[in-house]
């Protein structure tokens, strides 16, 4: 990648990037331009969509010119009774631009969904669907009494008139988070993951989270009692540390896991929730990593196969996340 | 009443960290941001950065790698962390509540020097 | 980088009408910018005058407005008074960050 020019922007001003299309630094990271979606031609300088799981494939290794945006291996999503492809973006409607990532589906408004407040000039704001138009528009009314513009003037929030705080942007977002997918791990240290727009700018993101369901050195068949088939959650008897990578998290924690069965009934956790664990590793570096904290398991026949790419949805999804 | 108090330490040695802490009383951080502002002697304002209400953060690009802000909103607290700090960051650092910026606090005067 | 410009000072007579610009040096200042104007009276801490181009703060008189117009925000005083003489600074938002204008000194004349 030849970054060696001086960082030299079209525009000073950052550009104005149509719905659903991001707004990322350029791979040599001087400029903010508009990412190149799906199928679209891509160079080092002009980035693919990071947020919709894109890359830019250059084909043969020699040539580092120009590539295509391409999915990275994703579920594809089917909405509407079509089928779209991981990081494919499609209009639902003419008031919907939607992106597919790894089989979810976040979408975007394109009409405003501003908030009119009361003023002076127009101090009774109303929405009208206009004949031809897909968008709603916004029409002033004359008061009936003139002594009502007082309290009308009055009831702006504060937070929606003066400021950028993203969180009022989100007033434009559809906010769409899946399930936390089952842990890629039956036993020891996994990986789940997830789909959201929950954030700022309503861009989906997959987001992940460290998982145990169980620790694998624990035989913990031998502790079913006598006439039963399943332990769901088995005491763990002492506080345990998590390890990762060679890093052991600094606090102990008395975590709860999910049990076995024998009678071919597997235990998945069923209510989970999210928290952050710092981990110390040998040369002294800390990272703080979100993991999956049990509350409750189930036991039940809805069992992945090794192989099973059709993982059963109960298997695949945790429910009743607390974060 | 809306007030917002700075607080933390006036002189920091060169590569030092600084933390200071805004207290805020008459409203709720769940409900407004607060963001960070410093004066050197004799200038202008420098933004520095926001905790908005739903606790995503905004930095200014020039501090990005020094700088941390979160809140702990049970006890109407953001705080404030800059690292590495050099004399030409002695300022009187001012916190205020987002929403145009309407109520600031008196500011603290920190002094970096050996 | 985006820079925001104030004129150094201005200065009115009692009464009279001032001004004072906030010129963003990328192009056409917008709804987007959330163009802010604050207050810093002699020897006091900073107090909020305007939000989001044209919102007057809770308890800022309408002799206080603000607007915009091509590259520029706006601070305008109408029935200007002695206790308005003060320093004044816009920021401007650039989608990821605030930049604070170089402030303008007010002087009430006479």
């Known amino acids: 990648q030849d970054c060696s020019a001086q960082c030299q922007c079209a525009a000073e001003a950052a550009p104005h990037c149509p719905a659903g299309v991001s707004l990322v630094l350029d791979g040599c990271g001087c400029c903010r331009v508009c990412a190149k979606q799906l199928g679209e031609l891509c160079t080092e300088r002009d980035p693919c969509d990071p947020h919709k799981g894109l890359f830019c494939d250059f084909g043969s290794p020699a040539n580092r010119k120009i590539g295509v945006c391409t999915a990275k291996d994703g579920a594809p999503c089917v909405f509407g009774g079509s089928v779209y492809r991981s990081g494919e973006s499609f209009q639902s409607s003419c008031k919907y631009q939607c992106t597919c990532l790894d089989g979810a589906v976040g979408c975007v408004p394109l009409c405003s969904m501003d908030v009119r407040l009361p003023s002076p000039d127009c101090p009774f704001p109303r929405r009208v669907k206009l004949p031809g138009k897909c968008c709603e528009e916004w029409v002033c009314d004359e008061p009936k009494d003139r002594t009502a513009v007082g309290p009308a003037l009055a009831a702006y929030r504060l937070e929606d008139t003066f400021g950028p705080d993203p969180t009022m942007m989100r007033a434009n977002c559809l906010v769409q988070t899946t399930e936390w997918s089952a842990c890629s791990k039956t036993c020891g240290m996994g990986i789940s993951t997830r789909v959201t727009n929950d954030n700022t700018f309503c861009r989906l993101e997959k987001q992940s989270r460290l998982c145990m369901v169980r620790p694998c050195e624990a035989d913990l068949e031998e502790n079913i009692k006598k006439g039963k088939k399943c332990i769901r959650t088995p005491k763990i008897a002492k506080p345990v540390k998590f390890e990762l990578s060679g890093c052991t998290s600094v606090k102990t924690y008395r975590a709860k896991f999910c049990g076995v069965c024998t009678d071919g009934r597997c235990c998945t956790p069923h209510r989970t929730t999210t928290l952050p664990v710092e981990f110390k590793c040998p040369d002294g570096e800390i990272m703080k990593k979100n993991m999956m904290f049990i509350k409750t398991c189930a036991c039940h026949y809805n069992c992945p196969g090794d192989n099973d790419i059709f993982e059963s949805l109960y298997y695949r999804k945790m429910y009743g996340d607390m974060a | 009443e809306v007030t917002l108090k700075e607080s933390g330490p006036v002189l920091v040695k060169p590569t030092e960290t600084l933390t200071l802490t805004c207290t805020v009383s008459?409203?709720?951080?769940?409900?407004?941001?607060v963001h960070w502002i410093r004066q050197p002697p004799g200038k202008g304002l420098e933004w520095l950065g926001v905790?908005?209400?739903?606790?995503?953060?905004d930095y200014n690009a020039a501090f990005m790698s020094r700088l941390t802000i979160s809140k702990d909103t049970s006890k109407s607290q953001v705080v404030f962390t800059m690292t590495n700090m050099d004399p030409v960051d002695t300022a009187t650092y001012y916190c205020?509540?987002?929403?145009?910026?309407?109520?600031w606090g008196q500011g603290t005067t920190v002094t970096v020097s050996s | 980088e985006s820079v925001v410009t104030q004129p150094p000072s201005v200065s009115g007579a009692p009464g009279q009408r001032v001004t004072i610009s906030c010129r963003s040096s990328?192009?056409?200042?917008?709804?987007?910018?959330?163009a802010n104007w604050v207050q810093q009276l002699p020897g006091t801490a900073f107090k909020g005058l305007i939000g989001?181009?044209?919102n007057r703060a809770p308890g800022v008189p309408d002799r206080f407005s603000g607007s915009k117009s091509g590259t520029s925000a706006s601070l305008a005083i109408t029935g200007l008074q002695a206790e308005d003489e003060a320093d004044y600074y816009c920021?401007?938002?650039?989608?990821?960050?605030?930049?604070f204008g170089g402030g303008t000194k007010l002087t009430v004349l006479g």
């Open positions: 920021a401007l938002w650039y989608s990821t960050h605030y930049v």
């Open positions: 990328i192009g056409a200042v917008t709804t987007s910018n959330y």
């Open positions: 205020a509540r987002d929403g145009g910026f309407d109520y």
């Open positions: 905790i908005w209400r739903r606790g995503g953060t």
């Open positions: 008459g409203f709720s951080l769940s409900t407004f941001g």
């Open positions: 989001g181009t044209s």
